[in-house]
């Protein structure tokens, strides 16, 4: 169908318009590449050649006036189809007197260079050459809409013709969609729909669920407030204009939630009193995890119970776990939370703490010198069983011998069967200070306070023991 | 929705080798341990072994040197490589999600606490 | 390694009976509790019904229950249904294994 419209929506005068959707006079494959134009040269009309487009030059040039150069009127305003095909041309009429002509087409304020398909053909006559420079699309696009006009230059002027306007139409285009969205359950928020033709106007429906929202169409753009869902949702918008509808993308609305329990926990390493733990995070609810819970009991059914919470952040899945007593057994749950809440507790594990030295040494260190005078009698209670930090294995008793000029320091190890031990006497007129300290198999504990007793010389005897209280004992 | 599809199954003669795959959709096996089981027809489930989300596998002791457990987690699938196959390898193969999975990285092994999700099972069967 | 033992292996019952099947373990489960139970039916995958010994699997109707700690447990059906009659698994982990045990399996077929 053609149509004049003689004043489109256009700014700027036009001699008319057309509105087309027959396919194009010339079948030419539609590139994007540049190939430069085809010309038919005057002198061989039949023969197309590439180059700059030249009036054949006249030899006599006559000195009457001439009328100024105007491009002839033509179609101002196109309308047609996506991927329909167009042809449009600018016309002129030059005289013969004129050389170095050349015709370029110009769209929106660029030059078109190459490929597109311009044919420049020259019709001779005896005065002037009529020019018709023709530009066709194969397959139009919306790329394609826009103001083209003609430029030829000739003698260093510029003669440009009236613009035509080509206006693609098509089904509406979506120029902002509905995204993705996490929403709180039952509040309110917005989802935006825009959409644009030509032709214009382009009208919203909404949909939700595949059910349409809104009876009357909106004029786009078109925002859709949610009063709220209680569950998931997907929505789309349908833009529809006189070319028929376009639907946009589907977008899923999540309701928050709170978060699934961890899905895995690793014990990477145990020491005496720390435990290394990471975790596999489970699904987030649809909001951003921002901490994590360390739920940490005592395994022992003698135990009180109660639990040690341990909080961290949720990044990254790592924590150390401190202060936990040794050799001991633990329960251990991660629990992590995101903006609507806590996660359940994830199934608890078992960790174990490794032994330590222990971290007390031996009290109530007592030292006294035996009857005979030969031996050192030294008794001591060991460690609270708490502090031990494992299984007693023995002990370490260090005795240095001092006296004027001499100083010896000899270690004994004795077992951890009962709390005395019997020692040499290696030196006499002489002050032994002994010091005990605690053994398992985690390493060997602190070593008590100092202890000393004089060791008089042969045949003098001093029974009083030396000894460092217990604690409080003082 | 979330589920898993088993593939790869098939005839293949004793002694042959060959590939199982488990895909898993709805959910990642970047945050999964996944587990392999076997059922003998007419007979009781059997447990293969179990990959975690790290990549860490651990296999029954008689699958051990025969089968390995692998997977891609760009392609969200998990896979069986069964190597040197036997008749008594005829078996629906299934694959699982592990709901819960604790490991002991310092001592190598890890306990599964549960398999929340199973695939429909693959049948291979071994015979000349 | 450590075994999971079913029994009955087979047991008939009728719709609205109250069935009881029990499994034992060679040693304590892990963390004593970590004992799932599953149900199968013919050419079907197993499906989770239970697990941490007594915890229902999400929709798994509540006629069905778990009990037991350490070596013994328990699923109890509370009133057999017709959807019910399938096999039954226990199956369980243990400290310093990766094995993860499967019972036997009980058949609950219809009298």
């Known amino acids: 169908r053609e149509e004049a419209k003689p004043y489109p929506l256009f700014p700027g005068p036009f001699p008319g318009s057309l509105q087309t959707d027959h396919t194009p006079l010339l079948s030419l494959p539609h590139a994007s590449g540049y190939q430069p134009a085809l010309m038919f040269s005057p002198t061989q009309p039949g023969r197309p050649h590439t180059g700059n487009v030249a009036i054949p030059q006249v030899t006599s040039v006559e000195s009457k006036p001439l009328p100024p150069l105007a491009f002839k009127h033509t179609v101002g305003h196109i309308i047609l189809s996506e991927h329909k095909g167009v042809k449009f041309n600018c016309s002129i009429s030059v005289p013969n007197i004129y050389q170095d002509t050349t015709i370029s087409w110009w769209k929106d304020g660029k030059e078109l260079l190459g490929a597109h398909h311009a044919i420049t053909q020259f019709y001779p006559d005896d005065e002037v050459t009529a020019i018709i420079a023709s530009f066709s699309i194969t397959s139009v696009q919306r790329s394609d809409n826009g103001s083209y006009i003609c430029k030829m230059k000739i003698n260093n002027e510029e003669i440009v013709s009236d613009p035509i306007y080509i206006e693609v139409q098509g089904l509406p285009h979506f120029t902002k969609q509905p995204e993705s969205m996490n929403v709180t359950r039952n509040t309110a928020f917005n989802l935006t729909c825009q959409a644009v033709g030509p032709p214009e106007p382009v009208n919203i429906f909404w949909v939700q669920n595949s059910s349409r929202v809104n009876e009357q169409p909106e004029k786009s753009p078109s925002v859709l407030t949610v009063p709220g869902l209680t569950e998931m949702a997907v929505f789309s918008c349908e833009a529809h204009n006189d070319k028929g509808l376009t639907v946009s993308k589907g977008v899923q609305i999540n309701i928050k939630a709170i978060p699934s329990p961890p899905t895995e926990v690793s014990i990477r390493n145990s020491t005496a009193h720390s435990i290394l733990i990471s975790w596999v995070p489970g699904f987030d609810g649809y909001s951003p995890f921002r901490n994590c819970s360390i739920q940490v009991k005592e395994a022992d059914p003698l135990s009180n119970g109660s639990v040690m919470i341990f909080n961290t952040s949720a990044l990254p899945h790592l924590y150390q776990i401190k202060q936990l007593q040794a050799l001991a057994n633990y329960s251990i749950g991660v629990s992590c939370m995101n903006e609507i809440g806590w996660s359940a507790v994830s199934p608890w594990i078992l960790a174990s703490t490794t032994e330590g030295a222990p971290s007390v040494a031996p009290l109530n260190v007592t030292v006294f010198l035996n009857e005979s005078s030969d031996n050192v009698d030294i008794r001591w209670m060991k460690p609270p069983t708490k502090q031990q930090d494992g299984e007693l294995v023995g002990y370490r008793i260090s005795h240095v011998w001092q006296s004027a000029g001499i100083s010896k320091e000899l270690l004994e190890e004795v077992g951890q069967n009962g709390s005395r031990a019997r020692i040499s006497v290696q030196v006499h007129n002489a002050t032994c200070t002994v010091r005990i300290a605690a053994v398992t198999r985690g390493g060997v504990g602190p070593f008590s306070d100092p202890v000393k007793i004089f060791i008089p010389a042969h045949g003098w005897v001093d029974y009083a023991p030396s000894s460092t209280p217990a604690p409080g004992n003082a | 929705e979330q589920q898993l599809v088993e593939s790869g199954g098939g005839l293949i003669q004793p002694g042959g080798s060959l590939r199982l795959s488990c895909a898993a959709s709805g959910f990642s096996l970047s945050s999964n341990a996944m587990s392999w089981v076997r059922q003998a027809p007419g007979k009781g489930l059997e447990w293969i072994g179990i990959?975690?989300?790290?990549?860490?596998?651990y296999s029954a002791s008689w699958a051990k040197g025969r089968f390995t457990i692998s997977k891609d987690s760009s392609k969200n699938t998990m896979y069986l490589q069964m190597n040197s196959l036997r008749a008594e390898d005829t078996a629906v193969y299934f694959c699982a999600r592990v709901g819960f999975f604790v490991g002991y990285g310092a001592y190598d092994y890890g306990i599964i606490h549960r398999l929340d999700l199973w695939g429909q099972g693959t049948l291979v069967t071994v015979s000349s | 390694d450590a075994q999971l033992t079913q029994s009955p292996s087979t047991l008939s019952a009728s719709v609205g009976d109250r069935v009881t099947i029990t499994c034992q373990s060679s040693k304590s489960i892990y963390n004593n509790n970590w004992l799932s139970w599953y149900q199968q039916k013919p050419g079907k995958p197993p499906k989770l019904l239970i697990y941490?010994?007594?915890d229902l699997a999400s929709g798994v109707p509540s006629r069905f229950s778990g009990s037991g700690s350490g070596t013994e447990f328990t699923l109890t059906i509370s009133s057999l249904q017709p959807d019910d009659f399938a096999t039954y698994y226990c199956a369980g982990g243990y400290s310093g294994d990766s094995d993860y045990a499967f019972g036997g399996g009980t058949k609950v077929e219809i009298k």
């Open positions: 941490d010994a007594s």
């Open positions: 990959i975690s989300s790290s990549g860490s596998t």
